[in-house]
């Protein structure tokens, strides 16, 4: 195909790929009609003057995963048609000024995963058509004012995984077309007011894994198109009352792994499109009424691994679309009988790893569609008569690791469990804690007459029978709603953002994928 170097493969579609450790310089001669060139996993350490001079039709150039540490300023001369240039995963510490001069068609520039120490306004001043700039995974400590001033068409900018300690409020001011800005995994401690004011078209802002302690009240007030806001794993201890007030398009908000002690009423909203709210791993101690009442479309609410000891009866007002509620691993001892009354569409609720001693008889009265209830590892000794009777879709109920008191009062619950064993799962069954002579025996098969021989056992009305129908979908443990292998954080929309963690610790987790955390 017009002369293909021996170290490369060339396709009829004008695509050239050169790979291998034996390559130490840009192979020649390259086909003059090449439109795509990939130089991957080689031992090339430098790019000299004009190695691509004879392939001026080139549209995409990937020079990735090499030993590249030095580039001559004129290396990309004569590539006026180039639209995509990736120098990612190399060893570049310095970019020569004028390196991208003449690349008038360039739309995507990937410089990620190098060792760049600084960038200057002159580096990108010629790239007026650039739409995407990837600078994540470098060693940048600051971004000078004016660095991006000429990139008025930029829609995606990734500065994640650098060493940025502060951001100038002017650095993004000309990026009115920017849709995605990623600043995750830096060392930012605060973000000045006005930093994002010019970003009127921003749809995604990733600020997770920094050291942000305080958010300015009006930080996001100009970002009316923001859809995804990632603030997890910072040091945020309080949220200014109006900080999320102007975000009507937001559908994803992550705040897990911060130091939030309280959620002031009205803090979230109005956010009519928010579907998921991740608040696990904070220090929240109570939930006041109406704290989520503006989140009418919320489907997933994760409040696990906090210190919640009090939930006001109207805390979940407005959450009529909620499907998943995770409250596990908190300090709950009491639940008001009305607390879940508004959650008509709830399917999964996790209450495990709390200190619940009893449940109100009508706690699930309005929540007819419940499919999974996690109550393991609490302080429950018994449950009220008929608490699960109306839950026809219930297919997973976890009751183990509670100090069940197997006296005559347990009979109604025992009888109901006997009829509904498949819902309990096969791995761990509830066992008696008291009296001492039956401790450790299965609650389901215990003979209550033996358990309390000195007590006359009256006729106790059994729980009304809710038979286990074979055609109801049962979840074997391998595919259980509370599978033990789970995601511990929401999966962001891009792989360079989040590490997916896996755990097998059943006592900590036991949640659906969305509820995990």
């Amino acid at each position: 195909y017009h002369g293909c170097p021996s170290e490369c493969t060339c396709s009829r579609a004008s695509q050239v790929e050169c790979t291998g450790a034996r390559i130490v310089a840009v192979p020649t001669p390259l086909p003059w009609n090449a439109m795509s060139l990939q130089i991957l996993n080689t031992h090339i350490t430098e790019l000299n003057e004009s190695p691509f001079l004879n392939i001026s039709a080139l549209i995409a150039l990937r020079i990735e995963k090499n030993e590249l540490s030095r580039i001559t300023p004129g290396a990309f001369r004569n590539l006026g048609s180039l639209r995509y240039l990736s120098l990612a995963n190399n060893k570049l510490q310095v970019l020569p000024i004028g390196l991208f001069q003449g690349l008038d068609s360039l739309e995507s520039l990937l410089l990620s995963s190098n060792q760049l120490l600084q960038i200057q306004p002159a580096h990108f001043s010629q790239c007026s058509n650039l739409k995407e700039l990837q600078l994540h995974g470098n060693h940048l400590e600051y971004i000078p004012d004016g660095a991006f001033d000429h990139l008025v068409g930029l829609t995606k900018l990734n500065l994640g995984k650098n060493s940025l300690t502060h951001i100038s409020p002017r650095v993004f001011q000309h990026l009115g077309n920017l849709q995605v800005l990623r600043l995750y995994e830096n060392r930012l401690t605060d973000i000045p007011m006005g930093t994002f004011d010019g970003l009127v078209n921003l749809q995604e802002l990733a600020l997770q894994q920094n050291q942000i302690g305080l958010l300015s009240p009006g930080l996001f007030h100009n970002n009316h198109n923001l859809q995804r806001l990632y603030l997890s794993n910072n040091h945020i201890s309080q949220l200014p009352p109006s900080v999320f007030m102007q975000l009507p398009q937001l559908n994803r908000l992550t705040l897990f792994g911060n130091s939030l002690k309280e959620l002031s009423p009205g803090i979230f909203g109005p956010m009519p499109n928010l579907r998921e709210l991740w608040l696990y791993d904070n220090h929240i101690s109570s939930l006041p009424d109406n704290v989520f009442s503006n989140l009418r479309q919320l489907q997933v609410l994760i409040l696990s691994r906090n210190q919640i000891s009090f939930i006001s009866p109207g805390a979940f007002n407005g959450l009529t679309e909620l499907r998943e509620l995770s409250l596990h691993t908190n300090a709950l001892q009491d639940l008001d009988g009305n607390v879940f009354r508004m959650l008509a569409n709830l399917q999964n609720i996790s209450l495990q790893n709390n200190r619940l001693r009893q449940l109100p008889g009508n706690i699930f009265a309005n929540v007819n569609g419940l499919m999974a209830i996690q109550l393991q590892n609490n302080q429950l000794e018994n449950l009220p008569l008929g608490i699960f009777d109306h839950l026809g879709k219930l297919c997973e109920l976890r009751l183990y690791d509670n100090p069940w008191r197997c006296d005559s009062d347990i009979l109604p619950l025992r009888n109901w469990l006997l009829l509904n064993q498949p819902r309990l799962g096969t791995d761990t069954v509830p066992v008696c804690f008291s009296p001492a002579n039956v401790r450790g025996q299965s609650l389901i098969i215990i003979n209550v007459n033996v358990a309390v021989p000195s007590v006359h056992v009256p006729e106790v009305p059994s729980y009304p029978e809710t038979p286990w129908y074979p055609d109801t979908p049962s979840y074997p443990d391998t595919t259980s709603v509370s599978s033990t292998t789970e995601l511990t954080s929401p999966v962001e929309d891009y792989t360079d953002l989040t590490t997916i963690q896996v755990t097998d610790d059943r006592s900590v987790w036991g949640m659906t994928q969305a509820q995990s955390g």
């Epitope: 002031s264 009205g266 009424d289 009866p313 009491d334 009354r341």
Partner: antibody
């Protein structure tokens, strides 16, 4: 229907204690928080604290902490508020009240007048 | 503690009048404000909760509005049975606190 019936008026001397009862009916007593609120003559209403009858857990207004004790007898569906070290400014009508679908007071007892006078 | 400042402390009005009572919280309480009516020798009666929702059985002439720190109770057309004292209450954070009351008297 939900009803809260309180004990009768009391006259106490300064330094003494008073225990006011509140008998609940018309709902499952153990399932809902019960609060105590007081109103001194010509003064605003003051929230004193709550109890969750199912567990006996309590929360008190710091202003009364150490002097107020809220308890319950689940077998009698009754909550109690005891105020010790009474002073003349504790002269007030004491109400028990139950929350509804939020932390506002939907159901009230009729009130118990406690007069502290030497 | 969150202070609830109610005004006026008293007002005189005639049957049919429109009456407005305001309540100002010392810090943001979202919509967690309730309004009560109290008549002499009686327990308070819940009128409005969540700032603007009428309690069951409360006539439509009573309405509430506001959020954050400023709240209003309006009686659109005062009736003879409405002469009473009205209190606002915040239930956003402990300790829950009440306003000082507004006494609505016959002019």
């Amino acid at each position: 229907q939900v009803q809260l019936v309180q004990s009768g008026a009391e006259v106490k001397k300064p330094g003494a204690s008073v225990k006011v009862s509140c008998k609940a009916s018309g709902y499952t007593f153990t399932d809902y928080y019960i609060n105590w609120v007081r109103q001194a003559p010509g003064q605003r209403l003051e929230w004193m604290g709550w109890i969750y009858p199912g567990s006996g857990n309590t929360k008190y207004n710091e202003k009364f902490k150490g002097r107020v004790t809220i308890t319950r007898d689940t077998s009698a569906s009754t909550a109690y508020m005891e105020l010790s070290s009474l002073r003349s400014e504790d002269t007030a009508v004491y109400y028990c009240a139950r929350w509804g679908y939020g932390a506002y007071f939907t159901y009230w007892g009729q009130g118990t007048l406690v007069t502290v006078s030497s | 503690d969150i202070q609830m400042t109610q005004s006026p402390s008293s007002l005189s009005a005639s049957v049919g009048d429109r009456v407005t009572i305001t309540c100002k919280a010392s810090q943001n309480v979202g919509i967690n404000v309730a309004w009560y009516q109290q008549k002499p020798g009686k327990a308070p009666k819940l009128l409005i909760y969540s700032a603007s929702y009428r309690s069951s059985g409360v006539p439509s002439r009573f309405s509430g509005s506001g959020s954050g720190t400023d709240f209003t109770l309006t009686i659109s057309s005062l009736q003879p049975e409405d002469f009473a004292t009205y209190y606002c209450q915040q239930y956003s954070s402990f300790p829950y606190t009440f306003g000082g009351g507004t006494k609505v008297e016959i002019k």
